[in-house]
């Protein structure tokens, strides 16, 4: 076809000075020599469609997709990516070829896909297709461990599908409650994948590699313990393994344990029992309920019954997708300068979340604590009484959650002043937001009691610094006050603060600061 333009598609790889920081398109990046993507006409396509060679990009790399068009006259263009139109500004190079570019900075999964470029020239219309994918990178991960039964043995294997392969350890504790904290002397650690001693009070498996440490607790119902006020609940996703341990101690061996799901006995092969005598000659029995890969119909009340103990139940809920349940409405707090205070978020989530607290673009570690009612709580106390906006962000495999908090610190105003040739301005960040008065100091009013009301302009929130509101008041210069000292005062329920300014002075000239409680 004589009318078809000569088209060249190229890929330009940019070497970012730091691949871990996003760059704006104006950022000077070192470019490698362009790679020809050989735009070929796609056969059997409706319309004129050119297809560039597939582009593989490293995560965090920056690239430019570029089309050079040798066609007479002007061209107009439009980029389309995932059904969204993107701006397109063609320009001409020294050889008078039309140049159209798409810059992708700091490549991520979300930027992978098909980029369509529609070009309209005076002679014809045509489409160019680029397919951009992320290069098969190695993603080191650390995943929560899970349990499997060891073949032909009454033992549990702990598995964490992580890279590098993690160091696996069992964390065992035989006392109750607080004494089972990680560094307690009651805690025993065994650096092995298989555990045979399954009678302990508290059994956890932990996996660690250079990304951190993740633990999973063996869900246990203890028939000798008083049941919780709320029914224990266990969430699992379809396909995950289910493990519940029922434990009971009795003076002799004359008792048995059974599992039921919704009043029906568990099928053979979905449970196994172990028993042992303890040091005081009492009998300990444990009965495991397990399903190697759960389905929706495994949801329900699992009840462990004993011939010598009251039965106890747990609700197992199988979900298709993970979730994070919490109220995301923003919360505002007002505290005194030395008042102890923590932000807290109460949530129910599965799988376990990872979270961060952020203030002033700085992220802080986030700790979670499980509550008895199946909820978890995360608290943040390290605000150092800095007012502003605090953000809690949580995510797991399937869900994301963000909650905003505003912290206001009650304190009396601190005033800063500046003056120009035409006006004087005062600023204050006290809370509650202060009110303003302006006073003129003259022979008639040496104590500056003569109030100025004309030409005053108050702004309640001049600038918002990470949620911190600043109040300002501006006095426009008039002949009546030129050459005089004026005083601006900010006051709130906690006190007053003033600043004296000599008007008509060149540039900022704060004169005296008065702190009046």
């Amino acid at each position: 076809n004589q009318d078809l333009p000569v088209i060249k598609c190229v890929l330009i790889n940019h070497k970012n000075n730091d691949s871990s920081v996003g760059k704006s398109s104006s950022y000077p990046m070192v470019s490698e020599s362009p790679e020809d993507l050989g735009c070929a006409l796609r056969p059997q396509s409706s319309g004129t469609v050119y297809e560039a060679a597939a582009v593989e990009v490293d995560v965090s790399a920056s690239i430019t997709l570029q089309v050079l068009v040798d066609a007479p006259g002007n061209i107009s263009c439009l980029w389309v990516f995932k059904h969204s139109s993107l701006n397109c500004q063609p320009h001409f190079d020294l050889q008078n070829r039309g140049v159209v570019s798409m810059v992708i900075l700091k490549m991520t999964e979300t930027q992978a896909g098909e980029y369509l470029l529609f070009i309209q020239s005076e002679a014809t219309n045509y489409t160019i297709l680029f397919t951009v994918s992320i290069r098969n990178t190695l993603l080191y991960t650390l995943r929560r461990p899970y349990f499997r039964k060891m073949e032909n043995q009454d033992a549990l294997v702990c598995i964490s599908e992580s890279v590098p392969e993690p160091i696996v350890e069992w964390v065992l504790c035989d006392s109750q409650g607080e004494s089972c904290k990680e560094e307690s002397p009651a805690v025993v650690k065994k650096e092995e994948k298989v555990l045979h001693e399954l009678f302990g009070t508290d059994i956890r498996c932990c996996a660690r590699n250079e990304l951190g440490r993740e633990c999973t607790r063996l869900f246990t119902i203890d028939l000798n313990q008083t049941p919780q006020t709320t029914l224990p609940q266990l969430f699992l996703k379809v396909g995950e393994p289910l493990w519940i341990r029922c434990k009971a101690v009795h003076v002799n061996h004359g008792f048995g344990l059974t599992w039921e799901l919704e009043n029906k006995a568990l099928e053979e092969g979905n449970y196994f029992e172990m028993s042992t005598y303890s040091t005081n000659r009492t009998m300990i029995r444990i009965l495991f309920a397990f399903v190697s890969s759960v389905a929706r119909n495994d949801t329900g009340y699992y009840t462990c019954s004993s011939s010598k103990h009251p039965s106890q139940s747990a609700l197992v809920t199988i979900v298709e997708k993970g979730f994070i349940n919490a109220t995301n409405s923003s919360e505002d707090y007002e505290i005194d300068q030395y008042e102890e205070f923590c932000f807290s978020v109460r949530f129910k989530a599965y799988p376990q979340i990872r979270c961060t607290w952020t203030f002033s673009r700085k992220s802080f570690p986030c700790e979670q604590k499980g509550l008895d009612n199946g909820y978890s709580i995360s608290k943040f106390c390290n605000h150092k009484h800095q007012p502003g906006e605090y953000i809690f962000h949580a995510e797991n495999d399937d869900a994301q959650f963000t909650k905003m908090f505003t912290l206001n610190i009650r304190r009396k105003p601190q005033v800063l002043a500046e003056a120009s040739a035409s006006q004087a301005s005062c600023f204050s960040d006290g809370y509650p937001l202060p009110s303003w008065t302006w006073k003129k100091c003259s022979d008639k009013s040496p104590n500056c009691t003569e109030e100025i009301t004309e030409g005053v302009w108050n702004r309640k929130a001049n600038r918002k610094v990470f949620g911190q509101w600043v109040s300002s008041s501006t006095l426009n210069m008039s002949e009546a006050i030129k050459g005089f000292l004026v005083k601006c005062c900010a006051y709130n329920s906690l006190g007053t603060s003033c600043e004296t300014i000599l008007l008509n002075s060149p540039g900022p000239f704060p004169f005296i600061q008065d702190n009046i409680s």
Partner: antibody
Framework: QVQLVESGGGVVQPGRSLRLSCAAS????????MHWVRQAPGKGLEWVAV????????FYADSVKGRFTISRDNSKNTLYLQMNSLRAEDTAVYYC??????????????????????WGQGTTVTVSS | EIVMTQSPATLSVSPGERATLSCRAS??????LVWYQQKPGQAPRLLIY???TRATGIPARFSGSGSGTEFTLTISSLQSEDFATYYC?????????FGGGTKVEIK
């Protein structure tokens, strides 16, 4: 540009201690795992230790476990290797190298790992009486 | 620990010829394997990660293959600057381990 500079090497007697430092620049140090690797004269490379991006986890080669400690100060963009109870077989050029970059993928923390992609020029440690 | 065995220890090749270097793991390491090049008096340089992906700026004549326990680094046409020692490293499990190295020298 991205750079790692080791220091602290020298001649030391067996049984004594030495601390190596590695100053990082040109990248967000706190987002990367960091490694120490050594090379005895005329021999191959030996991995020594790794520390996670936030300093919370360390792993060591069996030959140095219990004697060497890897640590980092993200506020100073510096990696350290504290070497105690030094032996003649610890004589080597010690390199620090950049590991994986931290990321969050659907609630799972991960590193995009391209191998140890940036290396320092090395610092020489000689253990001799 | 996983033992990485490289062969041959020395490879004599003429410029322009093909060089094939082997690295074997005592246990499977999936594709968690990296190749480095080192010249005398210099720090190692990353060539290949993920067993087969060329690092940024590495010429196309270098290619990696393999998975599990058997890995190969191929230099299709040796240039004068390619004469050096090559190391493989597994990072599938701790401790990370290097192979003993293959020295590629001019024939």
């Amino acid at each position: 540009q991205v750079q790692l500079v080791e220091s602290g090497g020298g001649v030391v007697q067996p049984g004594r201690s030495l601390r190596l430092s590695c100053a990082a620049s040109g990248f967000t140090f706190s987002s990367y795992g960091m490694h120490w690797v050594r090379q005895a004269p005329g021999k191959g490379l030996e991995w020594v230790a790794v520390i996670s991006y936030d300093g919370s986890n360390e792993f060591y080669a069996d030959s140095v476990k219990g004697r060497f400690t890897i640590s980092r100060d993200n506020s100073k963009n510096t990696l350290y290797l504290q070497m105690n109870s030094l032996r003649a077989e610890d004589t080597a050029v010690y390199y620090c190298a950049r590991g994986g970059e931290i990321t969050m993928v659907r609630g799972v923390i991960g590193y995009y790992y391209y191998g140890m992609d940036v290396w320092g020029q090395g610092t020489t440690v000689t253990v001799s009486s | 620990e996983i033992v990485m065995t490289q062969s041959p220890a020395t490879l004599s090749v003429s410029p322009g010829e093909r060089a094939t270097l082997s690295c074997r793991a005592s246990q499977g390491v999936r594709n968690n394997l990296v190749w480095y090049q080192q010249k005398p008096g210099q720090a190692p340089r990353l060539l290949i990660y993920g067993a087969s992906t060329r690092a940024t700026g590495i010429p196309a004549r270098f290619s990696g293959s393999g998975s599990g326990t058997e890995f190969t680094l191929t230099i299709s046409s040796l240039q004068s600057e390619d004469f050096a020692t090559y190391y493989c490293l597994q990072h599938n499990s701790y401790p990370l381990t290097f192979g003993g190295g293959t020295k590629v020298e001019i024939k």
